[in-house]
């Protein structure tokens, strides 16, 4: 069923990193337009990305509302020109998104080597905790305190001289680790949330090395 | 509103296992870690572990690994608590609770009723 | 295992302000540790007061308040009423546990 000379829309895809969500679908409109709505489970439908010929839609001002909701999206096809017409059962042909839960899938952008800093025999390495677009009390919340507990970051670190990597973890956003006196160290992190099934892993951050600008040496 | 309804007391045989359960309603039960906490008569609170009913992930206090395990079924958002070897010193109030989220906050803040368990021979 | 300890008992005067404190075993209490506060009344259970150091439950008056000063996880009182009469709990993350303090017991008199 639907309207002649439109079809529904397919291959729904949540892309979401950092909680910035888009959901993206298919095919290109020829002739028609669409209508993208977003609910909870329990909530009313709320339309967004009107009578758009996009084919994705930012639904992330609606979802950060509580990250922690499971949202289902639909798309409505209408044709273009008669955004008034409906299909043969009364409604517009729709197609529906699968769920998505931000909290346990939203992915983990790639994280940021703020600063390293060598004390004697330690490097103190700290992560950007990153902004996110959830907010509370008119303040952008940080990815660590959007997830807290659940997220850990893991550090890989290697002698510039060589190609041996060790690994560190951390609860917070700094490490503290032994090094060689007179070694030059590189870096990198990823953010990873242990607890999840789906997207638990970050991409790796960019490469740091010492001897270069971002970290502060002092000999003790 | 957020509501957590706890299963009824059991009085056990020392050896034995129980199953305590833990229905959840008002929220998204699959993103919020379920607690478990233990309070013996007269003493304190003891954390035993917590459950992310969408994941399945797990958490154990040392003290009760090998013996406690916990499960959820996100189908009737119930989670459950079975500790097996049941002994004298398992007589407590077993509570479920989680925590209130806002953006950020993380532990107990929604408790259930809680629920005796009597090990006695 | 990190041991967690607070005040066993402790008395205020109605209209007064307590301080309870958490301190750990394993050093300085810091956010990382999400400092939590619970309070227990006889026949009314358990209710959660602050949680991640200091974010009140929605129940929560604005005269309960959760901070760190210095090395301890503190809960602060301010104007306190009869009905705050309780035991209260504090509980701290340790990278992968919880662990909850023996609990003071508030009284008001």
């Known amino acids: 069923s639907g309207t002649t000379n439109t079809v529904a829309a397919y291959n729904l895809t949540w892309k979401s990193t950092n909680f910035k969500t888009i959901l993206e679908w298919e095919p290109k409109p020829v002739n028609q337009v669409y209508t993208v709505q977003i609910s909870t489970k329990s909530g009313d439908w709320k339309s967004k990305c009107f009578y758009t010929t996009d084919t994705e839609c930012d639904l992330t001002d609606e979802i950060v509302k509580d990250v922690k909701q499971t949202y289902l999206a639909r798309v409505f096809s209408y044709p273009a020109g008669n955004v008034e017409s409906t299909g043969s059962a009364g409604e517009p042909l729709y197609e529906n998104s699968p769920e998505f839960t931000p909290y346990l899938e939203t992915n983990l952008g790639q994280p940021t080597i703020q600063s390293f800093e060598q004390v004697g025999t330690k490097v103190n390495v700290t992560v950007e905790d990153e902004r996110t677009l959830v907010r509370r009390n008119n303040t952008f919340l940080s990815l660590r305190d959007v997830f807290g507990k659940d997220l850990i970051y893991t550090l890989y670190y290697w002698k510039s001289s060589s190609s041996g990597k060790k690994t560190a973890k951390t609860n917070t956003n700094e490490f503290l680790i032994d090094v060689d006196k007179g070694e030059n160290y590189c870096f990198s992190v990823q953010a990873v949330i242990p607890s999840r099934t789906v997207n638990r892993k970050s991409t790796d951050s960019p490469v740091e090395c010492m001897g270069q600008e971002k970290g502060e040496f002092r000999e003790i | 509103e957020v509501q957590l309804q706890q299963s009824g007391a059991e009085v056990m045989k020392p050896g034995a296992s129980v199953k305590i359960s833990c229905k959840a309603s008002g929220y998204t039960f699959s993103s919020y870690w379920i607690e478990w906490v233990k309070q013996a008569p007269g003493q304190g609170l003891e954390w035993i572990g917590e459950?992310?009913?969408?994941?399945?992930?797990?958490k154990y206090n040392e003290k009760f690994k090998g013996r406690v395990t916990f499960t959820a079924d996100t189908s009737t958002n119930t989670a459950y608590m079975e500790l097996s070897s049941l002994r004298s010193e398992d007589t407590a109030v077993y509570y479920c609770?989680?925590?209130?989220?806002?953006?950020?906050?993380?532990?107990?803040?929604?408790w259930g009723q809680g629920t005796l368990v009597t090990v006695s021979s | 295992q990190a041991v967690v300890t607070q005040e066993p008992s402790l008395t205020v005067s109605p209209g007064g302000t307590v301080t309870l404190t958490c301190r750990s075993s394993t050093g300085a209490v810091t956010t990382s540790n999400y400092a939590n506060w619970v309070q227990e009344k006889p026949g009314h259970g358990f209710k959660g007061l602050i949680s991640?150091?200091?974010n009140r439950g929605p129940w929560t008056t604005a005269r309960f308040s959760g901070s760190i000063l210095g090395d301890k996880a503190v809960l602060t009182l301010w104007g306190a009423h009869a009905e705050d009469e309780a035991d209260y709990f504090c509980?701290?993350?340790?990278?992968?546990?919880?662990?909850f303090g023996g609990g003071t017991k508030l009284t008001v008199l």
């Open positions: 459950i992310l009913p969408g994941s399945a992930s797990t």
């Open positions: 509980a701290l993350w340790y990278s992968n546990h919880w662990v």
């Open positions: 991640g150091t200091n």
């Open positions: 609770a989680r925590d209130y989220y806002y953006g950020s906050s993380y532990g107990f803040a929604y």
